[in-house]
């Protein structure tokens, strides 16, 4: 070999200078007598080489690289040979950092694998091969005095954890543990841990289970869950405290924590939850009161809380069939009494015959908000309840009585906007307990079954805003009935539109007779349309050839009109405007010409 490189150090701190020399032997006869030595770092030629001929005839070039900023590179010593660069020798240069102090050293004792698992953070990248060794010794006291050394634990490449097997451990006795990091640029050691393996024991969590319902045990209350846990048996004799966490399966709620619980509670009633809600639950435990590590969270248990019986007030209203007064249509509306009033599965209407204690006859069971049933002849009252799997609401009595109370007066209605109507009245004397307001389409589309109704609990109210099922351009019938202690007053009704439509078109004008200075016109009125308010008046407009306009207002019952004071032999444009409270519409234009002075009248 013709050339040889030697370097001040093959491994340096990143950014440090490095000096290299390349010596070319004299016996390389195929070379120039005065060859020029070139330096290359990686693929780049490096200037600054100082070349000299030594006394033994060899050529030497020395180069100093001021900053080695590559973590790994090849430094080559070359000669120009023909058109190419001939490499005589090359060395690998490495640059990096000495190892930082390993930090966050922590250990866990796993009782199942019978080993102490220690892990650490190695610190920033050194860019150099760095070895880590977990070192430890047994100690009688608090690790100030070193006892027997324990065999070094060397992690697999790239791992930052290591297991010390049971045969090297002494339980209930302290051990000194630290990590040593080493590379070509230096050695560092983590702070020493002093621990008893049992004080870092990490247990397995208990298994959560639902409690098997026993016949004598009371079922859980609404919003409660009964659960139990099976402790992890290998840790059974270790005193522990546990904590439970739960969250609803649906929604974005975060975990709620319950604890501390003793491991041996074994069974537990968790309350204060939402009724009829599916929950996810987990448990974990820690050695306590002695030190330890929290176990992982147990696998999830999914349970549903029991629901609560409906807590609602049922507002009721009823109607008798005109042809068969014993057939009653009962309507109701649930009004929640609490924020969480319970799910309603259905409704039952029932009747208890007098003198038959305990005998209850169901009249209907439905999920709807109304039902029609035949009222037994002796029945004056029925009971309505809402129910679900947890029970029923408080029964609402419905008394079927004659209308004996006073009527309200001055019932009136007015539109608020296209989707609401205000109905007002003057309350009767004495004040009622409340009112039932019903509304639905008026004639010709009127239907008893399609009425909407509302209960106004305030007997002193003098009006109600109808906002449900109100559409513009429809005629509504509104019925208001006052309610008294054991009876009701007669119902009153009124008709109203929330918004009326302008006439869709005005009648067509027809010429009946014409003269020199007059013209008789007629038209056929449009038939009334549902949702369109009645006509209030017509206005007839006529314009002469000189663009002079004239008009006359006619009442809504008009069927014709005579234009007087026209010019003979003149052209006129005429149209009719039909108007209602909701707007007006023009007819098409009729054009006519009056007769010449010498012409005879046309009839």
């Amino acid at each position: 070999e013709c050339g040889h490189i030697s370097v001040s150090a093959p491994i340096v701190h990143l950014g440090d200078p490095i000096t290299a020399s390349c010596i070319i032997k004299q016996n390389c006869s195929h070379l120039d007598p005065e060859p020029q030595i070139l330096w290359r770092l990686g693929a780049e030629l490096q200037p600054g080489g100082r070349q000299q001929r030594l006394s033994d005839g060899t050529q030497e070039s020395i180069i100093t690289l001021p900053h080695l900023n590559h973590t790994q590179a090849f430094l080559s010593c070359c000669l120009n040979w023909g058109n190419s660069l001939q490499i005589l020798d090359q060395v690998e240069l490495r640059a990096g950092y000495p190892p930082a102090i390993p930090h966050n050293l922590s250990c866990l004792m796993n009782l199942t694998t019978s080993s102490l698992i220690c892990q650490w953070e190695p610190g920033p990248e050194t860019h150099l091969p760095t070895s880590f060794t977990l070192k430890s010794f047994k100690s009688r006291g608090n690790c100030q005095t070193q006892g027997d050394s324990i065999l070094d634990c060397v992690p697999k490449d790239g791992q930052s954890h290591c297991c010390i097997p049971r045969k090297h451990l002494l339980l209930y006795q302290n051990m000194g543990i630290w990590v040593q990091a080493e590379n070509a640029l230096g050695t560092s050691m983590s702070p020493q841990l002093c621990l008893d393996p049992m004080d870092v024991v990490k247990l397995e969590p208990p298994m959560l289970r639902t409690m098997d319902p026993s016949p004598e045990a009371a079922p859980p209350q609404a919003g409660c869950l009964q659960l139990c846990w099976e402790p992890w048996q290998p840790g059974l004799h270790i005193n522990q405290k546990c904590e439970l966490r739960h969250k609803p399966q649906r929604g974005e709620a975060s975990w709620a924590l319950v604890g501390p619980l003793p491991l041996e509670a074994l069974q537990y009633e968790l309350c204060g939850l939402l009724p009829a809600t599916a929950y996810t639950l987990q448990i974990r435990c820690i050695r306590w009161p002695l030190p330890g590590h929290w176990s992982d969270w147990s696998p999830s248990l999914e349970l549903r809380t029991t629901e609560r019986a409906p807590t609602v007030r049922l507002d009721t209203w009823w109607r008798q069939r005109q042809l068969d007064p014993r057939t009653v249509q009962l309507f109701w509306k649930p009004v929640p009494l609490e924020e969480d009033s319970g799910r309603i599965q259905g409704y039952v209407v029932s009747w208890r015959p007098s003198g038959q204690a305990g005998a209850i006859l169901p009249l209907c069971n439905t999920t709807e908000l109304s039902c029609t049933f035949h009222l037994p002849s002796e029945a004056q009252e029925v009971a309505l309840v809402a129910y679900n799997s947890a029970g029923t609401s408080r029964p609402t009595p419905v008394v079927f009585s004659e209308s004996r109370g006073p009527a309200l007066t001055r019932l009136h209605a007015m539109a608020r906007d296209p989707h609401s109507l205000w109905v007002g009245w003057e309350p009767p004397n004495p004040w009622p307990q409340g009112y039932v307001i019903e509304w639905g389409l008026g004639p010709p589309s009127a239907s008893n079954s399609n009425k909407t109704w509302r209960m106004e609990q305030n007997g002193r109210a003098t009006g109600f805003l109808l906002k449900e099922n109100i559409r513009p351009f429809q005629l509504y019938e509104i019925i208001v009935t006052p309610l008294y202690q054991d009876t009701m007053g007669p119902s009153q009704h009124v008709y109203a539109y929330s918004q009326e439509m302008a006439p869709s078109h005005a009648p067509e004008l027809h010429l009946k007779h014409i003269g020199k200075t007059w013209a008789q016109l007629e038209w056929v009125p449009e038939p009334p349309e549902l949702g369109k308010s009645p006509l209030t008046h017509y206005t007839i407009f006529w314009t002469n050839a000189q663009n002079q306009s004239f008009s006359a207002i006619l009442n809504a019952s008009s069927r014709g009109f005579v234009l007087h004071g026209l010019e003979p032999a003149s052209l006129y444009h005429i149209h009719l405007m039909a108007a209602s409270q909701a707007g007006a519409t023009n007819s098409t234009v009729l054009t006519l010409m009056t007769l010449t002075p010498e012409g005879s009248e046309l009839h």
Epitope: L111, S114, K167, M198, P231, Q233, P234, L236, E264, P289
Partner: antibody, heavy 118, light 107 residues
Framework: EVQLLESGGGLVQPGGSLRLSCAAS????????MGWVRQAPGKGLEWVSS????????PYADSVKGRFTISRDNSKNTLYLQMNSLRAEDTAVYYC???????????WGQGTLVTVSS | DIQMTQSPSSLSASVGDRVTITCRAS??????LNWYQQKPGKAPKLLIY???NLQNGVPSRFSGSGSGTDFTLTISSLQPEDFATYYC?????????FGGGTKVEIK
């Protein structure tokens, strides 16, 4: 120094009852599981029952389940074994023992002899 | 249930001998194996817990090894006071079981 002192043994007829007590001292009784182990004459050791530190967990050997009841009074540092429906095969020396965290019997009483015979 | 089988059931040895007693579990018990010594008319005494941990006050000639199903108690140099019956016990799962015992007698 851990001391466990059993009492309550004696002669009892088959079907009869007996209550063993174990007075503990020298350690914090309420922090440890305790247990009863018996040894029939000339035989090996047989686990009878254990009780958790607060008394909430009480496993039993199948041979005594439903007849024996283990209990403790942490305020009196005392362990009990109520034995009902005694049989001849229950004849043994009954040892009270303190358990360690890994289920080892760290300390033992001197034992009390229970003889079931007609 | 985990059954414990101890062997031999008895052995004769001289002072100074190395004695080995084995205990086999019917299924894996990790390191949850304890050894006891009992002398006639006395209560048992804990020697080794968790397979290899020497109980305080127990001479270092006693040692334990093994894990899973096979365990060994070794007395490196038998002393006159070591003639007794030795029991193993598993403590990983309920119910707890003891081995049948090994009686160490003077040869």
């Amino acid at each position: 120094e851990v001391q466990l002192l059993e009492s309550g043994g004696g002669l009892v007829q088959p079907g009869g009852s007996l209550r063993l007590s174990c007075a503990a001292s020298g350690f914090t009784f309420s922090l440890y599981w305790m247990g009863w182990v018996r040894q029939a004459p000339g035989k090996g050791l047989e686990w009878v029952s254990s009780i958790s530190s607060s008394g909430g967990v009480t496993p039993y050997a199948d041979s005594v389940k439903g007849r024996f009841t283990i209990s403790r009074d942490n305020s009196k540092n005392t362990l009990y074994l109520q034995m009902n429906s005694l049989r001849a095969e229950d004849t043994a020396v009954y040892y009270c023992a303190k358990l360690g965290e890994l289920g080892q019997y760290m300390g033992w009483g001197q034992g009390t002899l229970v003889t079931v015979s007609s | 249930d985990i059954q414990m089988t101890q062997s031999p059931s008895s052995l004769s040895a001289s002072v100074g001998d190395r004695v080995t007693i084995t205990c086999r579990a019917s299924q894996g018990i990790s390191s949850y194996l304890n050894w006891y010594q009992q002398k006639p008319g006395k209560a048992p005494k804990l020697l080794i817990y968790y397979a290899s941990n020497l109980q305080n006050g127990v001479p270092s000639r006693f040692s334990g090894s093994g894990s899973g199903t096979d365990f060994t108690l070794t007395i490196s140099s038998l002393q006159p006071e070591d003639f007794a019956t030795y029991y193993c016990q598993q403590s990983m799962w309920m119910p707890i079981f003891f081995g049948g015992g090994t009686k160490v007698e003077i040869k």
